[in-house]
């Protein structure tokens, strides 16, 4: 905290300019009018203030706006944003996407800080949903943003926003998140033709149910092994050898290299060895010929 002292004669700041870098902290406190600072915040960013000097400028704004800064000031905070605490940011009402972009730019290239997380949370809550433009902006700055949300939060994403999602945005999503996103993606891309549809839906297939995988197997999609390995095990298990062969197309040969890993391993255990042999890949572990397969889960459902 800087002590209150009178501004020396002739040092009262008439505008925010580079001459202020020569002021000591107490002089900044005494000689810079907070209202002037608020109206000329955009100039602060072009002046190489020390971090200590920035602390003084922040303190002046805090005194002027104890209930939280107005958006006109927030938009021009620049570096000063890095001085804000999550508690400061919770007082803000940020509604403009331009303001959000300006502040994310300051943190660009760094991990998502608690300040940024709080800012995004405030912004999204203020909008009521994660619309396409917001999602576009957030994933541009933080590709992993979508996968940092809980399934409950993801449920507020409208299907139209899914168009903004790139494959790399889903890299760190877990099955629970993909379970929420997949139906939205299916709805968003429903009017696309077969091959185009598959290109768009591919990244979301970790949330696809068995019946959708069966449908895809009829469309010559040639799913790659990396995508297949991310499918839900429970969705893959009911697929027949013929369906998997059609689903993977020329990539079916890759099953051999993955036969010890889920979901391939579990799927092999559910197939007749006879059927697996038709692939000619030497896959082992299927149900031996002559064995009767009882689907106990079906039996329980009937009784």
């Amino acid at each position: 905290e800087v002590e209150k002292t009178a501004c020396p004669s002739g040092k009262k700041a008439r505008e925010i300019d580079e001459s202020l870098i020569f002021y000591k902290k107490w002089e900044l406190e005494a000689c810079v009018d907070a209202a002037l600072l608020a109206t000329q915040m955009d100039r602060v960013n072009a002046i190489p203030f020390t971090y200590e000097q920035l602390d003084v400028l922040k303190h002046k704004l805090d005194e002027l706006y104890p209930q939280g800064y107005p958006e006109s000031v927030i938009q021009h905070l620049g570096y000063l944003f890095l001085k804000m605490s999550p508690e400061d940011i919770r007082k803000w009402n940020v509604t403009s996407l331009e303001t959000l972009k300006a502040l994310l730019e300051v943190n660009k290239g760094h991990e998502m800080s608690p300040q940024v997380a709080t800012l995004i949370d405030r912004f999204v809550k203020g909008r009521g949903q994660l619309d396409k433009d917001t999602l576009d902006t957030l994933t541009a700055f933080y590709p992993g943003y979508l996968c940092s949300l809980s399934p409950e939060e993801l449920s507020s994403v409208p299907p139209s926003s899914i168009w903004a999602v790139r494959p790399q945005d889903l890299d760190t999503c877990d099955p629970r998140q993909l379970d929420v996103l997949y139906p939205k993606a299916r709805l968003a891309f429903q009017n696309m033709n077969g091959s185009e549809y598959f290109v768009k839906i591919q990244s979301f297939l970790g949330g696809a149910p068995t019946e959708d995988l069966k449908a895809l197997s009829q469309q010559n999609v040639s799913m790659d092994l990396a995508t297949f390995m991310k499918l839900r095990t429970d969705a893959v298990l009911p697929l027949t050898v013929a369906e998997v062969q059609k689903l993977l197309g020329p990539h079916v040969e890759g099953l051999k290299a993955e036969e010890r890993h889920r979901p391939v391993r579990d799927w092999i255990l559910r197939q007749r060895q006879d059927d697996l042999d038709t692939l000619g890949l030497g896959l082992q572990g299927g149900i031996p010929n002559g064995y009767l397969v009882l689907d106990l889960s079906m039996q329980e459902a009937l009784s």
Epitope: A46, P48, F49, V106
Partner: nanobody, 118 residues
Amino acid sequence: LQLVESGGGLVQPGGALRLSCAASGFTLDYYAIGWFRQAPGKEREGVSYISSSGGSTNYADSVKGRFTISRDNAKNTVYLQMNSLKPEDTGVYSCAAAGGYGNSSRYWGQGTSVTVSS
């Protein structure tokens, strides 16, 4: 992405030194540069400033007429020529860059030590 200062050292009162502030990993063209110094136990203070174009310079009262700031954008470097040095000029000198595209970047150097003593 960083700023690296050099040129500091031990010099006698009345002597001269030329400090350099070089940018590595980014171009200084769009950045305003400030030179600061910090003496042991004292607050860091601004010494000199140069605008991104080089058209505007400014100095602390204590160094006016003795220090000159300049920039060579082709060499991605800003210089501080210090003449008629005094013992009170002793301290760690560091440079800072502010501005850049969209005015959203800032960089600080680690500093170079200047000692003025007989």
